[in-house]
């Protein structure tokens, strides 16, 4: 029989990304003898858990175990049995759980407790489930894309291994869009980070990085839509909301109780003379854009410059990888090409939003209506966030690279999270004398 005394020469790690709208399980693999080399870890599997995000299980925690079963069983199939007990499993929950914790710490703890108990029942090396901070989410996303792009490698290459590579060691900024939050992370050019909360210092592979990061809670695409609806229904004359962010002919009934369920809409909450209202799409990009801009408070800035809501943002610097929902939405809209200018993107969004709902449904028959109906809003929101929120311009737009995968690994925070927790990003060059693990990220 196979004995533990003869470990395999590869290792595996599992990270579950418990997002606001869904949970995904990622399996990573790397050669055991090259743990400290940059770029050796790669993703071998992604399993999307069927169902909503874990925060939605607050009233049915007993269902969490079943919810996680299929993807955990998939992990047992993919990873060799002899490796199961040595394979670390981490679960990181993001903004959906941050919002639940804001409402009730007790309920958030209960959900996490059941998640932990469910995951510890598997024959892996379960290392815990926790709500990661927005700052961590931004930082780990930045680490992931730069690790995969080979930016931490000191060996200069004459060839390019990925389409976005510029053959220099200048790191990429990271733009991450989720359902409940969005993160912006990059190394500013010789600029002091005026707000300490937004400053991170890393020493990776012998080089120091001063990184800016911020996570905007409630500004993920789903929560931004709830915010917009809550804002717009305030001024509606009756229970019909004529909404420019939905296609002409689209209709949907919304419960007011659902609208005010999230902490993100608290600032717009008011007593309405109805329990439900109907969204009626009118499909107008420009009006949708204007409505979205009202979510960004740009009138107040206690720093030399801000993004919105009084949050410091240094001048943008270098290239950016835009991933997660930035990529998924733009990919659906066929707008991820490097050749498509910002003006062209805007033009195409205008045309897309103006298309009648019946026509859209016919054109995209295989897409779930719930998702299909929101692409006009999401695309418009992405443009508004990047241009007015983060101050990208028509010129700097070409520095945004919409990235789904880099060399087969998904862009996102999970790989960076695992690299850090497994101590696979050394502070110094691996060839130099190893330092204690206290110097890791």
């Amino acid at each position: 029989t196979q004995n533990k005394a003869l470990p395999e020469n590869v290792k595996y790690g599992i990270v579950l990304d418990a997002g606001s709208s869904h949970t995904s399980l990622y399996i990573y693999k790397w050669p055991a003898e090259k743990e400290n080399d940059t770029g050796v870890v790669h993703q071998v599997e992604e399993c999307r858990v069927k169902g909503p995000g874990i925060s939605k299980f607050v009233q049915k925690v007993n269902e969490i175990g079943i919810y996680l079963t299929d993807c955990m069983e998939r992990a047992r199939e993919v990873i060799p049995r002899s490796q199961h007990q040595e394979t670390p499993v981490y679960l990181g929950a993001t903004a959906g759980m941050r919002l639940l914790r804001m409402e009730s710490e007790e309920l958030a703890d209960r959900v996490l407790d059941v998640v932990e108990r469910s995951l510890s029942n598997y024959p892996f090396d379960f290392q815990g489930a926790r709500i990661i901070t927005g700052q961590e989410e931004g930082a780990y996303g930045w680490i992931t894309i730069n690790y995969l792009l080979g930016k931490f490698s000191q060996k200069t290459r004459w060839f390019s291994i990925v389409p976005y590579e510029t053959n220099n060691q200048e790191t990429f900024g990271a733009l991450d869009l989720g359902g409940a939050s969005t993160q912006v992370t990059f190394v500013p050019q010789n600029q002091t980070i005026e707000s300490p909360d937004n400053a991170l210092q890393f020493r990776l592979y012998g080089k120091d990085y001063n990184v800016y990061t911020h996570s905007f809670l409630c500004y993920g695409k789903d929560q931004a839509l709830w915010q917009k609806l809550a804002k717009d229904i305030q001024v509606a004359s009756n229970e019909i909301l004529r909404d420019p962010c939905f296609h002409p002919g689209y209709k949907k009934v919304v419960n007011v109780s659902d609208l005010y369920k999230t902490p993100c809409t608290k600032r717009f909450e008011m007593t309405l003379p109805f329990q439900q209202f109907e969204i009626q799409g009118i499909g107008n990009y420009q009006q949708c854009h204007q409505s979205i801009l009202e979510l960004f408070n740009t009138s107040y800035c206690p720093y030399s410059q801000c993004a919105f809501n009084g949050i410091f943002l240094p001048p943008l610097q270098g290239d950016f990888g835009a991933f997660s929902a930035f990529y998924f939405v733009m990919k659906f809209l066929n707008l991820t090409s490097e050749k498509v200018s910002q003006e062209k993107v805007t033009e195409m969004m205008k045309k897309f939003c103006a298309q009648p709902w019946e026509e859209i449904k016919t054109s995209y028959a295989g897409v779930k209506e719930k998702y299909l109906s929101e692409y006009c809003f999401s695309g418009t929101y992405i443009l508004s966030l990047l241009l007015q929120g983060y101050h990208f311009t028509a010129d700097s737009w070409e520095h945004i690279h919409f990235i789904g995968k880099i060399q087969g690994s998904d862009a996102g925070w999970t790989l960076g999270y695992m690299l850090n927790l497994t101590n696979m990003i050394p502070a110094e060059q691996p060839l130099s004398t190893p330092l204690s693990h206290s110097t890791y990220v």
């Epitope: 196979q2 004995n3 049995r81 199961h84 007990q85 510890s120 029942n121 090396d125």
Partner: antibody
Framework: EVQLVESGGGLVKPGGSLRLSCAAS????????MNWVRQSPGKGLEWVGE??????????HYAESVKGRFTISRDDSKNTLYLQMNSLKTEDTAVYYC????????????WGQGTTVTVSS | EIVLTQSPATLSVSPGERATLSCRAS??????LHWYQQKPGQSPRLLIY???QSISGIPARFSGSGSGTDFTLTISSVEPEDFAVYFC?????????FGGGTKLEIK
């Protein structure tokens, strides 16, 4: 030689407590998940519970029938596994085996000789 | 929890004959099924792991097969020392469970 030796069994009244020990030798105890399995007189085998490693924060799992009453612990420095049994019931009467798997997991290729626990008034 | 049902409860065979013991799981457990032999006054002994994997030191006449919910332990030619009780065990998920056992007795 790989060996597991249980001790601590005996006669105890219902509601009473008992602590079983299992001394391990011949293998690196701290590297392996350890289990307790019991067998009632003339009956089949029943898994009692497991304890994992220090790296797993010594995580434990139990059969529903003993949950809240039995506690498994280990002392890696002494190569010893323990089973603390509280609120004992007559149906806990059994031979208790200390077991482990030196290959892979969740099957038992090493067994102790067993120690008998009798719960009776 | 996964329930394992063994059949028959008692199997009578003569030495030299073939013995076929069955174990059925209440839900699919892939190949996570293990077989043990127990003789009176002794601790159980692992015979087969992961449905069909043989253990060094166990005679080749013992073999296992099956996957999903139906599993079989076969003794190709029963020897006198094989008369004992045989248990199957779910090694797929917690709680770990055992079948009720099949007693192999001399005919």
């Amino acid at each position: 030689e790989v060996q597991l030796v249980e001790s601590g069994g005996g006669l105890v009244k219902p509601g009473g407590s008992l602590r079983l020990s299992c001394a391990a030798s011949g293998f690196t105890f701290s590297k392996y998940w350890m289990n307790w399995v019991r067998q009632s007189p003339g009956k089949g085998l029943e898994w009692v519970g497991e304890i994992r490693l220090k790296s797993n924060k010594y995580g434990t799992h139990y059969a529903e029938s003993v949950k809240g009453r039995f506690t498994i612990s280990r002392d890696d420095s002494k190569n010893t596994l323990y089973l603390q049994m509280n609120s004992l019931k007559t149906e806990d009467t059994a031979v208790y085996y200390c077991t482990t798997q030196l290959d892979l997991y969740w099957f038992f290729d090493v067994w102790g000789q067993g120690t008998t626990v009798t719960v009776s008034s | 929890e996964i329930v394992l049902t063994q059949s028959p409860a008692t199997l009578s065979v003569s030495p030299g004959e073939r013995a076929t013991l069955s174990c059925r799981a209440s839900q699919s457990i892939s190949d996570y099924l293990h077989w043990y032999q127990q003789k009176p006054g002794q601790s159980p002994r692992l015979l087969i792991y992961y449905a069909s994997q043989s253990i060094s030191g166990i005679p080749a006449r013992f073999s296992g097969s099956g996957s999903g919910t139906d599993f079989t332990l076969t003794i190709s030619s029963v020897e006198p020392e094989d008369f004992a009780v045989y248990f199957c065990q779910n090694g797929h998920s917690l709680p770990l469970t055992f079948g009720g056992g099949t007693k192999l007795e001399i005919k």
